[in-house]
Interface confidence: medium
Amino acid sequence: SERCDDWGLDTMRQIQVFEDEPARIKCPLFEHFLKFNYSTAHSAGLTLIWYWTRQDRDLEEPINFRLPENRISKEKDVLWFRPTLLNDTGNYTCMLRNTTYCSKVAFPLEVVQKDSCFNSPMKLPVHKLYIEYGIQRITCPNVDGYFPSSVKPTITWYMGCYKIQNFNNVIPEGMNLSFLIAFISNNGNYTCVVTYPENGRTFHLTRTLTVKVVGSPKNAVPPVIHSPNDHVVYEKEPGEELLIPCTVYFSFLMDSRNEVWWTIDGKKPDDIPIDVTINESISHSRTEDETRTQILSIKKVTSEDLKRSYVCHARSAKGEVAKAATVKQKVPAPRYTVELACGFGAT
């Protein structure tokens, strides 16, 4: 056959769908690879062809669109399963072609089983809610296009295995689940089950997402440097190891980049001709506030190093702060026989 622009296997679009539920999968060509949409392609005389490779097989085969009740069908640039079966798992290819043009892309489709509590190997999207921040909502995801607006589905929400019917601060509002005030106890997996009729049959769509309650922007503060501070003096003798921790607390801020760095005499440690290492550790609170610690280490400090200025810097979307460490050369303890004797006038 003639040459075809092959975009390969698009593993970025690892599509997972539940067994025995409808699934509508758009050909990724128009979404991510080509600069025109399906309508333009269709009106230009291009044809969209679907085929697949079963799991653990190498053989490409056409998709059977003549199954009972049109279980698999194609509509424009969408491949429909009504519903899916476990053995639909495989790599699917959509190819756009005419006599002079050809472009194709493959993508993996995994049909996943779930248990009665909605547990499954499905990768779950995470929705972050601010703690104690007034009314916030999550919306049942990826249900657009499954039924026309004239159809009124029934939506049931679950937290874990339990139907949400005992409203503490969580209220089902159709496709939305409203959190009047979000608390740590609202962390968990939330599932919406959308039930709708189609051609005398009843279909269910199950969508699960993870809710993570995070620090509220109204409580957010600029970075706080806990160490170094004014109460600790780093007194060392030449030849000893110098260890200075820079410990910074960052309030959770959505999409904020938290940064911690040291300067030595106003320069980055890499720009100073001394043997310095910096080790970083990060910990998070239950509401995703972050504590970063960067330990500056000089194995064998010199008297020159003990005269330098060591400053810890921190930056977030809330602001930038800096704190200098107090570093001193340890004054050797006086030796009684010589120094003190001299002091008393001995010869």
Epitope: F167, N168, N169, F183, S185
Partner: antibody, heavy 118, light 110 residues
Framework: EVQVVESGGGLVKPGGSLRLSCAAS????????MSWVRQAPGKGLEWVGR??????????DYAAPVKGRFTISRDDSKNTLYLQMNSLKTEDTAVYYC?????????WGQGALVTVSS | QSVLTQPPSASGTPGQRVTISCSGN????????VNWFQQLPGTAPKLLIY???QRPSGVPDRFSGSKSGTSASLAISGLQSEDEADYYC???????????FGGGTKLTVL
């Protein structure tokens, strides 16, 4: 099926004490916020107070007329909510309802009648 | 005197549409969701409408709620004799740090 059943109502003298219990079933009681609402004879509904789940701090809020005299507590191991009423006044005479939720009261018990009279 | 204000009574004939109002302020209805309860004679109250216009399962769609600013209303269309009951609105109140109820509206089906 969600059920809440109040018990412990009765006749008590002014200044006396009484403890109401509310047995809950059919939902995860430990995760639920619970409230008490009362209704004086021939009058409207009046919120008494609520208790949050332990995971949300287990804290309580009370209506001004009962603050300092009434205490709401819970025993998650027994799926039971309590209302301890001290220094009772004649105006506390009412049917006391136990309800699920802290904002939206979706399930109600049948109520326990408390009569404060000398 | 209740924090939320409701008319003490309302009436209508079978099949009619009746509306019950509930008036509050910025610290309750203006800021929080409104709930409506129905109390049939001699029974415990029952949740009818919550959060603007959501109905628990089993509540007919003849009942609907709406909210505008610091006021809310409950509408009952296609009035039936079994709708004869007391209706209460409720909302959380920030300034009082508690739930406040309306005084209740007695609905009579003529």
């Amino acid at each position: 099926e969600v059920q809440v059943v109040e018990s412990g109502g009765g006749l008590v003298k002014p200044g006396g004490s009484l403890r109401l219990s509310c047995a809950a079933s059919g939902f995860i009681f430990s995760k639920a916020w619970m409230s008490w609402v009362r209704q004086a004879p021939g009058k409207g509904l009046e919120w008494v107070g609520r208790i949050k789940s332990k995971t949300d701090g287990g804290t309580t809020d009370y209506a001004a007329p009962v603050k300092g005299r009434f205490t709401i507590s819970r025993d998650d191991s027994k799926n039971t909510l309590y209302l301890q009423m001290n220094s009772l006044k004649t105006e506390d005479t009412a049917v006391y309802y136990c309800t699920t939720g802290g904002y939206v009261f979706d399930y109600w018990g049948q109520g326990a009648l408390v009569t404060v009279s000398s | 005197q209740s924090v939320l204000t409701q008319p003490p009574s309302a009436s209508g004939t079978p099949g009619q549409r009746v509306t019950i109002s509930c008036s509050g302020n910025n610290s309750n209805i203006g800021s929080y969701i409104v709930n409506w309860f129905q109390q049939l004679p001699g029974t415990a109250p029952k949740l009818l409408i919550y959060s603007k216009n959501q109905r628990p399962s089993g509540v007919p769609d003849r009942f609907s709620g709406s909210k505008s600013g610091t006021s809310a209303s409950l509408a009952i269309s296609g009035l039936q004799s079994e709708d004869e009951a007391d209706y209460y609105c409720a909302a959380w109140d920030d300034s009082l740090n508690g739930v406040v109820f309306g005084g209740g509206t007695k609905l009579t089906v003529l």
